[in-house]
Structure formats: C-alpha cells, structure tokens
C-alpha cells in the first residue's frame, strides 16, 4: 500500500498547527518537564515489515487524535486551531486505515507486532496519567503539546523511511 503524497503533507500541516497551538512560553513551564519515554524503537522503520510499521503509525495517530478530542483538551486550546489539527489527524487516520485494511486482506501478511502496539499505548497512558496528576494545568498541556510534536516528528520520519523502502 502506498500512502498518498497528501498524507505526508497532512502530517507536516498537523505539526505546523500543533506548533501554532502553543499559548504560553515553554520557558515558563520548565519545572513541569517530564520524560514520557517515547518508544523510539517503534519508529525504527528497519525493525518492521511495512504492514507492521503502518499499524504502529495508525495507533500513534489514533491515540493522538483521542487525546486531543477530550473535553479537557477543548478547554485548553484555541478552538479553530484544535479543529483544524483534529481534521488533519482524521485524514491521516483514514489514509493509514485504508492501508492497514489492504494489508489485512493480503494473505501471508505477518501478524501485527503486538508489543509495538502495546508500547505506543503505554506511552499515551503515561501522558494521560501526567495530565490527570497535574490536573490538566496549562503548563501540563504545554509539556504534552511539545511531546506530541516530538512524536509526530518521529512518525513523519518513519513514513519517509517507508516511502524510501518502496
């Protein structure tokens, strides 16, 4: 399955929008910094077959979409930017979903790397618990926004590597 060129453009647009969503200076939130232990090995395109990598990407985008679809998120961000960001993520999900469905339909496709899916899920669990612990404070959201920018950058790089493999 080849992801459309519009997919990587959408990824870049999502990153730009997330960058624009920042409301407070990151420097005022230095005391709130947290290591969420991003599962970097899951973004190593060499580790997986393409079908597995796409499943991991889908999980990453889906969890990001869910995180920014909560009521707490709506209260934290400027509404029009948040809606545009969510729309970009939704489009990416559709692209990835079509690819995963296509791969599922292909016989002999290796089983999904379940530990990679779990690693992504656990990463977002750590982010969710951090927000709860910090009572969804503006600084907590700023730290999370910066972290998601990081993870989306990893996703973009993985997609580039997948395209080079084709």
């Amino acid at each position: 399955c080849d992801l459309p060129q519009t997919h990587s453009l959408g990824n870049r647009r999502a990153l730009i929008l997330l960058g624009q969503m920042g409301r407070i200076s990151p420097f005022s939130c230095l005391k709130d910094r947290h290591d969420f232990r991003i599962p970097q090995e899951e973004f190593d395109g060499n580790q997986f077959q393409k079908a597995q990598a796409i499943s991991v990407l889908h999980e990453m985008i889906q969890q990001t979409f869910n995180l920014f679809s909560t009521e707490d998120s709506s209260a934290a961000w400027e509404q029009s930017l948040l809606e545009k960001f969510s729309t970009e993520l939704y489009q990416q999900l559709n692209d990835l979903e079509a690819c995963v469905i296509q791969e599922v339909g292909v016989e002999e496709t290796p089983l999904m790397n379940e530990d990679s899916i779990l690693a992504v899920r656990k990463y977002f669990q750590r982010i969710t618990l951090y927000l709860i612990e910090r009572k969804y404070s503006p600084c907590a959201w700023e730290v999370v926004r910066a972290e998601i920018m990081r993870s989306l950058s990893f996703s973009t790089n993985l997609q580039k590597r997948l395209r080079r493999k084709d």
């Epitope: 995963v100 999904m112 530990d115 669990q125």
Partner: antibody, heavy 119, light 108 residues
C-alpha cells in the same frame, strides 16, 4: 453516554461455533479497541483478545489463537466474537469491554452473553 | 504470562470494618497498568481503581489502592453493605492481559 449491548444467550453443542455480538453507541466506534473477556460459572475473568474497529486488526491471547475470530461492522458499530470447536469448558459469560487510557480502560462493559455448551 | 494471585480467596468481615485485599504478581508490573474491578452477582465488572492508586469516577473515597512491583493492595477503610462483592486485580503491562482469580468479600 457510552453503551455496549450484547446479543442474547446461546446454547450450543460440543464442536459447534458461536458468534456473539456487541453493539456500541455513545462514542466514536472506530476510535477505541474493543476487548473480549469471559467468565466461566463461579470462576474469574479471562482476557481473550481485542480488535481495532477502525481497521479490523486483532490481537488474540495465545490460548484462543486458531479458535477465536473477532470482526467488526463499522456501518452498525458492532463487533463480533466467534469461537469455534466449542467444548464444555467454554461454557461462560462472554463480555465485551471498551479499551481506552487511564480511567477509561475497561470502564465500559457489555451486559454479558451466556454461552452454554452441552450435548 | 503474568500470573496475578489474590489473597485471601474469601474475606469475611462486618460492615464498618476495614478490608485489605492483596494481589501478588508473578513478575513485576508497572503500577500504571495495574487496575482493580468490583463485580456483583449477575453484573458486569465495574472499574474501581486505575493505575494502582487512582479512584475511578464515582467511586467513594473509602476505597484506596497502593503497591508497586509485584505486590499491590486494595483497601476499603470502612465497609458499607454495598461493598460485599468479588474484587479482581488486572494488569495490562504485557500480553496476554490477565486478571487475578478474585477475592470474595462476604458479610460475617
């Protein structure tokens, strides 16, 4: 509000298959993995596997691999769990439970479906 | 597979008393992925505590959770009549996800 409504009780003969459904409402169906958990009479809870309704990929517990098939129908927001080669030990209440994160993990359950396997 | 062993299997106490339920894991479980559920006869399980010590929505403050590594505890500070049920610990730290065999809390 989130609701998971399961199909009714079933009685099956050993060797047969059963297909249990779980209809979701009150949230975006494709956003959350759906899990299946079973409970034999007077026994504890046992995780069987999960399905991502968005693309249909599944993760099964090794114990059920080859005998269980989880599918979904996005048009009706319904997931299905089919168990084949039934034996008496499969007599249990089968639950669907929605995934999520933090306080949303298994926060929503179906009402359960009793499957009785008897000759 | 991470085996969760709950003790005691049955706990007989009176309303007003303190209940301490244990869950021991066969190998280390990150506290973020250890949950507790309550189940009453004929009902589906109900989420009580998530990530070892956080109270789920609508759960009274008499319930609390603690622990780390391989030993986790659910405590009910002062039992109410509606607390008599079966309690399960659950982990999703690694596949396959597992539950303890349950502790039945019954009225003495």
């Amino acid at each position: 509000q989130v609701q998971l409504v399961q199909s009714g009780a079933e009685v099956k003969k050993p060797g047969a298959s059963v297909k249990v459904s779980c209809k979701a409402s009150g949230y975006t169906f494709t956003n959350y993995w759906m899990h299946w958990v079973r409970q034999a009479p007077g026994q504890g809870l046992e995780w069987m596997g999960e399905i991502n309704p968005s693309h249909g990929r599944t993760i099964y517990a090794q114990k059920f691999q080859g005998r269980v098939t989880m599918t979904r129908d996005t048009s009706t927001s319904t997931v299905y769990m089919e168990l084949s080669s039934l034996r008496s030990e499969d007599t249990a209440v089968y639950y669907c439970a929605r995934g999520g994160l933090g306080p949303a993990w298994f926060a929503y359950w179906g009402q359960g479906t009793l499957v009785t396997v008897s000759s | 597979e991470i085996v969760l062993t709950q003790s005691p299997a049955t706990l007989s106490l009176s309303p007003g008393e303190r209940a301490t339920l244990s869950c021991s894991a066969g190998s280390s479980v990150d506290s973020s992925y250890l949950y507790w559920y309550q189940q009453k006869p004929g009902q589906a399980p109900r989420l009580l505590i998530y990530s070892t010590s956080n109270l789920a929505s609508g759960i009274p403050a008499r319930f609390s959770g603690s622990g780390s590594g391989t030993d986790f505890t659910l405590t009910i500070s002062s039992l109410e009549p509606e607390d008599f049920a079966v309690y399960y610990c659950h982990q999703w730290s690694s596949y396959p996800f597992t539950f303890g065999q349950g502790t039945k809390l019954e009225i003495k």
